[in-house]
Amino acid sequence: TKTESSSRGPYHPSECCFTYTTYKIPRQRIMDYYETNSQCSKPGIVFITKRGHSVCTNPSDKWVQDYIKDMKEN
């Protein structure tokens, strides 16, 4: 997978998400998540994988909200 620079792409975001991943990450690969800062130009949910990668996702995608619910419940 192509890794984009930390401040501009969906991988390894530092503060804000500037683009979102275009694929659905398998649930079993995700360990944690956090929301980007509300001051960012666009909202983002950052999923942290078991390998330590951080991936920017679109909060409006159903699978993203489903994963958040699942992690909150567990």
Epitope: T19, Y20, T22, E35, K42, N58, P59, S60, D61, K62, W63, Q65, D66, I68, K69, K72
Partner: antibody, heavy 120, light 106 residues
Framework: QSVKESEGGLFKPADTLTLTCTVS????????INWVRQAPGEGLEYIGW???????YYASWAKSRSTITRNTDENTVTLKMTSLTAADTATYFC???????????????WGQGTLVTVSS | AVVLTQTASPVSAPVGGTVTVKCQAS??????LAWYQQKQGQPPKLLIY???TLASGVPSRFKGSGSGTEYTLTIRGVECADAATYSC????????FGGGTEVVVK
């Protein structure tokens, strides 16, 4: 299943707009609500949305002066927009989606809209 | 931000004819595109999502196609009831709508 916006009306510049979206026939715990507006003779413009778990997100232009909240007991979602200008004159729609179309921004339940006019 | 540019209005077609409305995105949106129909004084109605999938209850004469940055809504066997404004929506990035294209049925 339906959604309905509260009455709009005439506002003065710098006023604060408060609109309520009342939903019927479905639960806010399984649906997201979007707010979209349409200036006279113009295209649709997204304002923001609140997820089925109650988190609100906003378009970049609207973020600094918009707040979306919900009351699950009353099945209502409220849009508050501050510092109105003439450019905010538009028909305001609320729209619901349950993610059936893979994304909560894709809405299949729309209210009739309510006209908001900002003029001194 | 993504910019969606639609076919200029109005687009005219005879009853029974074919109408094509184009929507061009300023960057690739991976088929995360919906089409809405809006009649005067009414709210939008969802027609198509994921660029080509018909929403529930939408007649099969409506067809969506395209990928990358170029998308098309085609209406075959146009009926009087199809006179409306058609708008595209991208939901890959920032939830942007096109400016709308008015379809006139003669």
């Amino acid at each position: 299943q339906s959604v309905k916006e509260s009455e709009g009306g005439l506002f003065k510049p710098a006023d604060t707009l408060t609109l309520t979206c009342t939903v019927s026939g479905f639960s806010l715990s399984s649906y997201a609500i979007n707010w979209v507006r349409q200036a006279p003779g113009e295209g649709l413009e997204y304002i923001g949305w609140i997820s089925d778990v109650g988190t609100a997100y906003y378009a970049s232009w609207a973020k600094s002066r918009s707040t979306i909240t919900r009351n699950t007991d009353e099945n209502t979602v409220t849009l508050k927009m501050t510092s109105l200008t003439a450019a905010d004159t538009a028909t305001y729609f609320c729209a619901g989606g349950d993610g059936s179309y893979s994304n909560y921004w894709v809405s299949d339940i729309w209210g009739q809209g309510t006209l908001v006019t900002v003029s001194s | 931000a993504v910019v969606l540019t639609q076919t200029a209005s109005p687009v005219s077609a005879p009853v029974g004819g074919t109408v094509t409305v184009k929507c061009q995105a300023s960057q690739t949106i991976n088929s995360r595109l919906a089409w809405y129909q809006q009649k005067q004084g009414q709210p939008p109605k969802l027609l198509i999502y994921e660029a080509s999938t018909l929403a529930s209850g939408v007649p099969s004469r409506f067809k969506g196609s395209g990928s990358g940055t170029e998308y098309t809504l085609t209406i075959r066997g146009v009926e009087c009831a199809d006179a409306a404004t058609y708008s595209c929506q991208e939901y890959a990035d920032e939830n942007i709508f096109g400016g709308g294209t008015e379809v006139v049925v003669k």
